[in-house]
């Protein structure tokens, strides 16, 4: 039978009765247009909504976009167009919301041509008021806020100058001309790349990486022949061109720029990128395209210093630069992550890792789930989950996979049950165990969303005709109910809940159709009542984590330690609440070899744990150099796997090699390093 | 093979305390949730609680919260379960087994090894 | 907490008989039932974990079936080894056990 039609399923009581008090309809009074919508805050209740119409007459665009916002999570909304004097807002910059719950949002209004400038409105309130802010420069992008003082904003201008504002957008002052690409750095640190010789595109690869600590007093130019960088985690990258070729390599900084190492990365060439897949403040994944077109390329893992890298997956699908990739952290879980490969035969399969990239397998096919037709032995199967490729192709997959940090273990996704990807309609898979094992949660393609922190999961039918049902399930997807919340359809546009999965409303949108006119309008559906009760001790359950064997002594142990966690039982129907802490309990495991990687100079051979020193380095394709300094070049062929908390067990020591001598290339030596005040 | 071996007979006043201790022998002691199943002279099962040795997290049933405490001691593969407060109707054979496990889910999976059984005597 | 209510109490049957005993629980518990034998001074036996899953070493003529609120258990040819008092416990909640039925040689 299909999930939630047979007798297991506890159903909730006087459901229909309780929603229906809690569904609060909202007609807006728009044509229909494109809308967008942001959260302003967290915990607050206030959303913006933004529509936008656009009517292409002939030598100009006429435009009218209308301002609402709610403080109740959407039940209501007040029109303010009026507070941005009903100017039209451009909807390519959408709404710049402040970090945290600083209240900020800007939003940058389209200006009639010739204008000196472009105009923002701004708010300090959570949308309450605004001012009106006329700009000495017309934007090029967002508003890029600090995340560490909302008070400071950047932005790039059309003519290329860099612009700062120390007092939430009040006053503007261009700190730089010639900029490429800005991007705010820890302790309000601004990292940008300027070109010399007439534009960014033309000086690719002989741009400069600039760095200001004091908001454009004072600069320092930390690297020359850039084509491009990037920061994840603790990391600062910059790809560098070569002297000799049109090649070029990964260098790492773990001190803002002050000091360079030469990443233990292939070089690529021009066709070819680097992509950053994630970070955090431990390790890095990258990714290193492939030469030639082949929509595929090798996934590294570092190491603490972002500087040796193991080889973590092969033909890692990812088709160009600023492409598509299907690479998902897999935020319930602590080491889970999923992408695809795209095999020999140019099937698409799926992935995953259990211990952050040290090892990838196939999904483990669902329970009473058969195998399709691309499947050559129909006993013998996987799940394979669409994600972005997936949707970029135009597929029937409405969402990508979704997971929460404080629902913990549960994944949601699309997928099919083969040998590879296939192109018929999906169903929609969950997981409870951070994608150790699957159901099949939902026939066919659904938008999915968490609420509560898991104690809710709402789905409503992907579908090309007008709708009017919501689906529901207090169980983590086990069984559902079904809820009409109207009873004139509409053709549906989105499902939004507020970030985090919190809350218990859900927003429904849509637009309704007439013989003239077409209306957006909302439904928002408030959960409150359905999980009637707080969740007591006796609603919890322990969980370990990546239990695999519990006779194995080590069972559970991922990156040196195992987590239990507390976790809601199925059967019991009541609210996690807004304050829910997701409990845990880490407990350190012993150290195995498996907890360290090799460092460089080392590698491990083919089924061996033992990492063994490679043959003479020089001019091979890996070589690195850290300024010849010995501190750094000094191991013993071993290195704890970044975040691994492993203690006692096995110490890998060995003789300690000095591997100075076998350096053979540098970058950015110090004397090229300057300094220039404004 | 997994053992478990209960510490002998104790006879009681009413008003004391009584620790019944529960040695592992021959599997992980440590990845494995332990239970206490009280039977009173001609009654059914009754469970009072149970620990993960893993970090010591108990948790008991209603009837006996406040009155029981279960510890467990790793380094002796040993579960302890400590009833205070005692009176007549305690008296009863107290078994500690261990709770079978497929999963990461500690207690869904039924008491796979039971203990011999510890009969606790509470008279005046 | 949730209670497990089995039926018979007592039951009294034949070399060869096949025996069902029913629970019932109060509420849903999806497959989280286990089913137990035990003997006279002797302690508990696991029989059935997850509903329907047989614990290795159980004699196959054992059987559970049954989810959410109504379970059973299925002896499909009583052996003399078989009389006894047999328990469903859940495990989707604070365990509790049913009330034990007796199967007593008729």
């Known amino acids: 039978s299909a999930p939630g039609e047979d007798e297991e399923c506890g159903r909730v009581r006087d459901f229909v009765a309780k929603l229906a008090n809690n569904t609060h309809q909202h007609v807006f009074d728009d044509l229909r247009g494109s809308v967008s919508l942001s959260w302003v805050g967290d915990s607050t209740g206030v959303i913006l909504v933004l529509t936008t119409f656009h009517v292409p007459l002939v030598i100009m665009t006429f435009g009218q976009s209308k301002l609402y916002r709610s403080e109740d999570y959407g039940k209501n909304f007040k029109d303010i167009t009026d507070l941005i004097n009903n100017t039209f807002i451009r909807t390519e910059f959408g709404m710049a919301i402040g970090p945290e719950n600083s209240g900020k949002v800007v939003l940058t209004a389209e200006v009639s041509g010739g204008s000196r400038g472009g105009r923002i409105f701004r708010s300090s309130d959570f949308a309450k008021n605004f001012v009106q802010t006329d700009l000495p420069f017309h934007p090029l992008t967002q508003m890029m806020y600090s995340p560490q003082n909302s008070d400071y904003l950047l932005a790039l201008s059309t003519e290329n100058g860099l612009w700062v504002s120390k007092n939430f957008g009040g006053k503007w002052e261009e700190i730089h001309k010639a900029v490429c690409l800005a991007k705010w750095g820890s302790d309000n640190t601004i990292f940008f790349t300027t070109y010399a010789n007439g534009s960014c595109k033309a000086d690719l690869g002989a741009l400069e990486l600039w760095r200001t600590s004091d908001l454009g007093k004072s600069f320092k130019t930390i690297g020359v022949k850039i084509y491009s960088f990037g920061l994840g985690g603790r990391f600062l990258f910059a790809s560098v061109m070569a002297d000799k070729d049109t090649t070029r390599r990964i260098h790492v900084s773990t001190d803002q720029g002050d000091t360079w190492s030469m990443a233990q990365l292939p070089s690529v060439g021009q066709e070819q990128f680097y992509s950053i897949l994630a970070a955090n403040d431990d390790m890095v994944f990258m990714h290193v395209d492939e030469p030639g077109d082949t929509g595929f390329g090798t996934i590294f893992t570092s190491d603490d210093r972002g500087i040796v890298y193991s080889k973590s997956l092969d033909r890692h699908l990812y088709t160009t630069t600023g492409g598509e990739t299907d690479f998902t952290n897999v935020t319930s879980l602590r080491g889970v992550y999923i992408t695809s490969v795209l095999s020999e035969d140019n099937s698409i399969q799926t992935m995953i890792t259990f211990d952050q990239g040290g090892r990838w397998t196939h999904l483990r096919k669902p329970e009473n789930s058969e195998c399709d037709a691309t499947a050559k032995n129909k006993n013998e199967c996987s799940l394979h989950i669409h994600a972005s490729y997936s949707i970029s192709q135009k597929l029937n997959v409405p969402m990508a996979p979704l997971s929460e940090p404080n629902a913990v273990g549960i994944v949601i996704a699309h997928g099919s049950v083969g040998d590879a990807i296939s192109v018929m309609v999906p169903d929609v898979y969950i997981s409870d165990d951070g994608g150790a094992s699957w159901t099949k949660m939902l026939e066919g393609p659904h938008y999915y969303t968490i609420l509560d922190s898991g104690g809710i999961i709402v789905a409503i039918e992907h579908s090309s005709r007008p709708i009017n049902v919501i689906k529901f399930s207090t169980d983590e997807g086990q069984c559902w109910q079904t809820y009409t919340f109207t009873r004139d359809p509409i053709y549906f546009t989105g499902l939004a809940s507020e970030p985090g999965a919190r809350s218990m409303n859900i927003s429904i949108w849509g637009f309704t159709e007439s013989f003239l006119t077409s209306q957006w309008v909302s439904y928002t559906i408030d959960f409150k009542d359905i999980l009637e009760r707080n969740c007591e001790e006796k609603d919890y359950t322990i969980w370990l984590a990546h239990s695999t064997d519990p006779e194995d002594y080590e069972d559970g142990c991922i990156l040196g330690y195992k987590e239990q966690f507390l976790r809601l039982r199925k059967s019991s129907v009541c609210q996690n609440g807004r304050d829910y802490v997701v409990t845990k309990q880490p407990s350190i495991c012993l150290c195995s070899l498996e907890d360290f990687l090799c460092d460089f100079g080392y590698y491990r051979p083919e089924n061996d744990s033992k990492c063994v020193e490679q043959p003479e380095l020089k001019g091979h394709d890996l070589e690195f150099c850290l300024y010849g300094r010995e501190e750094h070049l000094t191991t013993n062929g071993y290195r704890k796997i970044p975040g691994d908390k492993c203690q006692g067990g096995v110490n890998p020591v060995r003789e300690v090699k000095d591997l100075k001598k076998k350096c053979t290339s540098n970058f950015l030596s110090p004397e090229k390093q300057n300094s220039k005040s404004n | 093979q997994v053992q478990l071996v209960q510490s002998g007979a104790e006879v009681k006043k009413p008003g004391s305390s009584v620790k019944v201790s529960c040695k592992a022998s021959?599997?992980?002691?440590?990845?494995?949730?332990i239970s206490w199943v009280r039977q009173a002279p001609g009654q059914g099962l009754e469970w009072m609680g149970g620990?993960?040795?893993?970090?010591?997290?108990?948790n008991y049933a209603q009837k006996f919260q406040g009155r029981v405490t279960i510890t467990a001691d790793e380094s002796t593969s040993t579960a302890y379960m400590e009833l205070s407060s005692l009176r007549s109707e305690d008296t009863a054979v107290y078994y500690c087994?261990?709770?079978?496990?497929?999963?990461?889910?500690?207690?869904?999976?039924?008491?796979?090894?039971w203990g011999q059984g510890t009969t606790v005597t509470v008279s005046s | 907490d949730i209670q497990m209510t089995q039926s018979p109490s007592t039951l009294s049957a034949s070399v060869g008989d096949r025996v069902t005993i029913t629970c019932r629980a109060s509420?849903?518990?999806?497959?989280?039932l286990a089913w137990y034998q035990q003997k006279p001074g002797k302690a508990p036996k696991l029989l059935i974990y997850?509903?329907?899953s047989l614990e290795s070493g159980v004699p196959s003529r054992f059987s559970g079936s049954g989810s959410g609120t109504e379970f059973t258990l299925t002896i499909s040819s009583l052996q003399p080894d078989d009389f006894a008092t047999y328990y469903c416990?859940?495990?989707?909640?604070?365990?509790?056990f049913g009330g034990g039925t007796k199967v007593e040689i008729k």
């Open positions: 620990i993960i040795p893993i970090g010591g997290w108990a």
């Open positions: 087994a261990r709770q079978g496990r497929k999963t990461g889910y500690y207690y869904y999976y039924g008491m796979d090894v």
């Open positions: 021959g599997g992980t002691f440590r990845n494995y949730a």
């Open positions: 997850k509903a329907s």
């Open positions: 416990q859940q495990a989707d909640g604070h365990i509790t």
């Open positions: 509420q849903s518990i999806s497959s989280w």
